[in-house]
Interface confidence: low
């Protein structure tokens, strides 16, 4: 639509001419209000009832009215009418897009005087070259201060050109800045390079922290040996307490890993319980990763120039839903070896596992298992089904993780997982299992351990043995005797000792002939049906100096048992006063029906058992 | 099963180097933060350096920095203390000794990345004298 | 630099005794950054505590630890003679990376 033709928008009395009333409806843009702006501000353009039949001067428009005038309507209006609306704008407060500012600015061709009067974010697009003297300048940019610089992107032409100058307006030479010159700056500041932070540090730092945009990388650099050379205003990070932190919350992600180390642990730890708790850091509802991921959570783009290019440790001071947006799952594939050494919470340990899980959804390659770290202790029985681990170092590794800790059932699905996939428990394997968890043999069924191929019992050690039972024994003891066969007599009773729970008599016999000195404790493991049959002169050749303690153990299985099957006069000749064998002129019958429906012997003999009293008198066997 | 064996001790005069190494067996030694502490003849404990478990981060007590390079060489389970410009007061039991992997008490946060010393050597012995 | 007070220097006991030893920082400590150790003549230290209060492996359950801040307790609930030996706190938690304390020893009354 055409604008009217050239007519002065405002009459001398201030009384509109109907012909500019129809501008201000389009220059407005009353005919199309900005939906944009006013769902960004909040503001609402307002409908055109009334305005034609009561026509007001500009100063008189509600901001609603003044909302949205595309830039096109601007363009045919005196520097003077623009002038005239744009103080307007001031007036009413209204929030203009960049655009509208830019056109704005376009208008004004000339340097305005009362720079105070016009919009604050206007000066923005001014060419600050048009406010060359100095106190043109200085008031130019004492108002720029206040306006918001963010408006404008980083690599912004306009905003290029501010802060050089600025500096010069301010007459900063060199890259030395005082606390005042930064104040000056205002926003500008966020846009010093690194020479200025390395320089002015002291002042510089805290201006840097409250920047509302990420760094560029060589302010990034600067801050960080600026951080970790330990001069003011922070002081060295050896001595920073929970309130330096919070102090420099903006700069967090900007520390590398040598200055996170040398952080007191305690402070980190502490700090970042706080800030867990603190709303303020938490994002809004809609974006925050809901603990199972559910697939419908809304996916958030990474902030500008928080890409993580390396997992390191400035990834810790990641909110979960920068780590899900800004780290990429197959760098974090790639370089799982490290985030066992970065102080992840559990929260963000769980993201970490969903990007990889999504990355992996059959199941993780072995190259990224065998770095998993502390990351296993999230993996859950069912992830670990999917996996295929093959390689003994990676069973290691992860052993090691829950090392000290009771067998979790992700450990122990881990184990079954490797066992099966090796087809038997080898001796490296057994070694290892063995070394990480001494009962893992004996948590094997029978059946189980007859898989067991005889070269890996040399892998097992007394205290692996400790809680198996009888029946285990019996299936693990004839594969030692196998293992240890070729062995001399002292050395192979030291291999074969632990083993012996599982004996029969013969090779308990056997035993007894070489000298071993069995001590009391392993007597004590023996099977009561290898014992029983045992003769004194038996017992006392096979514990050697040992038999002393039989004494002690006297009321206790298998002694107990053995006892009451010998001769009291055989017992007598041990000098130890065991007591509860048979009497001469005794009989001992040998009930094995009983025996075997009882599953004890029945011995005929004095005390709780069935005696049979066969009066053997001398004259009658004369 | 998992061993520390400190060796290179010895009597050396003021002034002078000597190396110590530590080699490690029974566990992953790539895995793990290593440290030397000694103890003085009848004196308490004394921590000397640290350094990670990939060797990018060492660290040193103030007594010896400037004068002890910890190192480590992971292809070789070795860890080394390298002793320059040597004084009586540096006469101690020197022990090498393993950062442990361990959990703290929040459940919050797994403070697994610092860590007590979990497992050390017998120790060896440097004397200091002119 | 936090310094580590370890208190008493010597304690007489007999066995089947309680044993109660202090370690007090001279700044506050975060609980999971302490730790205790055994020390016998002529031998390493063993680790007994890390966290303040977690045995390490191996350490039979008589021995416990407590505290936070500032104030930490080793506790020996009966006196085994093989307990008989000195006893260090450390912390590993602040710069420098690590301090011990002085110790305590232990002794047969």
């Known amino acids: 639509m055409a604008l009217p033709t050239a007519r002065p928008l405002l009459g001398s009395c201030g009384t509109p001419a109907l012909g500019s009333l129809l501008f201000l409806l389009f220059s407005l843009g009353w005919v199309q209000p900005s939906r944009t702006l006013a769902g960004e501000t909040g503001q609402e353009a307002a409908p055109l009832d009334g305005v034609l039949a009561n026509p007001p001067n500009i100063s008189s428009l509600s901001p609603r009215q003044l909302l949205g005038f595309p830039c096109a309507e601007v363009s045919g209006l005196s520097t003077e009418r623009v002038r005239e609306l744009a103080v307007a704008l001031a007036q009413k407060n209204v929030k203009l897009s960049t655009e509208q500012l830019r056109c704005l600015a376009h208008r004004l061709s000339e340097p305005p005087e009362d720079l105070d009067a016009l919009p604050l974010d206007l000066l923005l697009f001014l060419n600050p070259d048009a406010f060359s003297g100095p106190q043109a300048c200085t008031r130019f940019f004492s108002r720029i201060t206040k306006a918001n610089v963010d408006l404008l992107p980083r690599g912004a032409p306009e905003r290029q050109r501010l802060l050089p100058a600025a500096l010069a307006c301010w007459g900063v030479r060199g890259s030395l800045l005082s606390e005042a010159d930064v104040r000056a700056l205002g926003g500008l500041a966020c846009d010093l390079p690194g020479r200025f932070v390395a320089e002015s540090a002291e002042v510089l730092l805290p201006r840097l922290v409250s920047c509302p945009g990420p760094l560029d990388q060589d302010q990034q650099e600067a801050a960080r040996a600026a951080l970790q050379g330990g001069g003011p205003p922070y002081g060295p990070p050896s001595t920073w307490s929970v309130s330096t932190m919070d102090a420099l919350r903006g700069l967090l992600p900007v520390l590398g890993q040598p200055i996170i180390r040398s952080i007191p642990q305690g402070i980190v730890a502490a700090w970042r319980q706080r800030s867990s708790r603190d709303p303020s850091w938490r994002q809004p509802e809609r974006t925050i990763l809901r603990p199972r991921f559910r697939r419908e959570v809304e996916k958030t783009a990474c902030p500008s120039g928080k890409k993580a290019r390396e997992i390191d440790e400035s990834l810790i001071f990641y909110k979960k839903w920068e780590l899900e947006a800004c780290v990429d799952a197959a760098l974090l594939a790639t370089q799982m070896d490290r985030v066992n050494a970065i102080p992840f919470t559990y929260e963000q340990l769980d993201v970490l596992k969903h990007k990889l899980d999504e990355l992996y959804p059959q199941g993780y390659p072995e190259s990224v298992i065998q770095h998993l770290g502390y990351l296993f202790l999230k993996m859950s029985p069912e992830d670990i089904r999917k996996w295929n681990v093959t390689s003994l170092e990676t069973l290691k590794a992860l052993l090691e993780v829950n090392k000290g800790h009771e067998m979790s059932p992700q450990v122990a699905t881990l184990i079954d997982r490797f066992v099966k996939g090796r087809g038997q428990l080898d001796k490296d394997t057994l070694d290892t299992l063995t070394a990480f968890y001494p009962g893992y043999l004996c948590s094997l069924s029978p059946e189980e351990l007859s898989s067991v191929p005889p070269s890996s019992i040399w892998a097992v050690r007394p205290q692996d043995l400790d809680t198996c039972d009888p029946r285990q024994l019996d299936v693990l003891y004839p594969k030692a005797r196998l293992a240890f066969q070729n062995m001399n007599g002292s050395e192979y009773f030291v291999k074969i000792q632990s083993f012996l729970g599982g004996a029969p008599t013969e090779d308990l016999k056997a035993l007894s002939q070489q000298n071993v000195s069995m001590d009391l404790a392993t007597f004590m493991k023996l099977r009561t049906d290898a014992v029983l049959p045992l003769t004194v002169a038996e017992v006392q050749k096979l514990l050697g100096p040992h038999v002393e303690g039989l004494k002690a153990e006297e009321r206790h299985r298998p002694v107990r048992d053995w006892i009451l099957r010998q001769r009291q006069d055989d017992l007598d000749t041990l000098g130890l006063g065991l007591q509860g064998g048979i009497p001469n002129g005794y009989l001992v019958l040998d009930l094995s029906m009983q025996e075997a429906l009882s599953g004890t012997p029945c011995l005929l003999g004095p005390g709780p058992v069935l005696t049979v009293l066969a009066l053997l008198l001398a004259s009658t066997l004369a | 099963q998992v061993q520390l064996v400190e060796s290179g001790g010895g009597v050396v005069q003021p002034g002078r180097s000597l190396r110590l190494s530590c080699a490690a067996s029974g566990f992953t030694f790539s895995s793990y933060g290593m440290g030397w502490v000694r103890q003085a003849p009848g004196k308490c404990l004394e921590w000397v350096a640290v350094i990670s478990y990939e060797a990018s981060n060492k660290y040193y007590a103030e007594a010896v920095k400037g004068r002890f390079t910890i190192s480590r060489d992971n292809s070789k389970n070795t860890l080394y203390l390298q002793m320059n410009s040597l004084r009586a007061e540096d006469t101690a039991v020197y022990y090498c000794?393993?950062?442990?992997?361990?959990f703290g008490s929040g459940s919050y946060y797994p403070l697994y990345y610092y860590y007590a010393m979990d497992v050390w050597g017998q120790g060896t012995t440097v004397t200091v004298s002119s | 630099e936090i310094v580590l007070t370890q208190s008493p220097g010597t304690l007489s006991l007999s066995p089947g005794e309680r044993a109660t030893l202090s370690c007090r920082a001279s700044q506050s400590v975060s609980s999971s950054y302490l730790a205790w150790y055994q020390q016998k003549p002529g031998q390493a230290p063993r680790l007994l505590i890390y966290?303040?209060?977690i045995r390490a492996t191996g350490i039979p359950d008589r021995f416990s630890g407590s505290g936070s801040g500032t104030d930490f307790t080793l506790t020996i609930s009966r006196l085994e003679p093989e307990d008989f030996a000195v006893y260090y706190c450390?912390?590993?938690?602040?710069?420098?990376?690590?301090?011990f304390g002085c110790g305590t020893k232990v002794e047969i009354k």
């Open positions: 966290g303040a209060s």
């Open positions: 000794a393993r950062e442990g992997a361990h």
């Open positions: 450390q912390q590993y938690g602040s710069s420098p990376i690590f301090t």
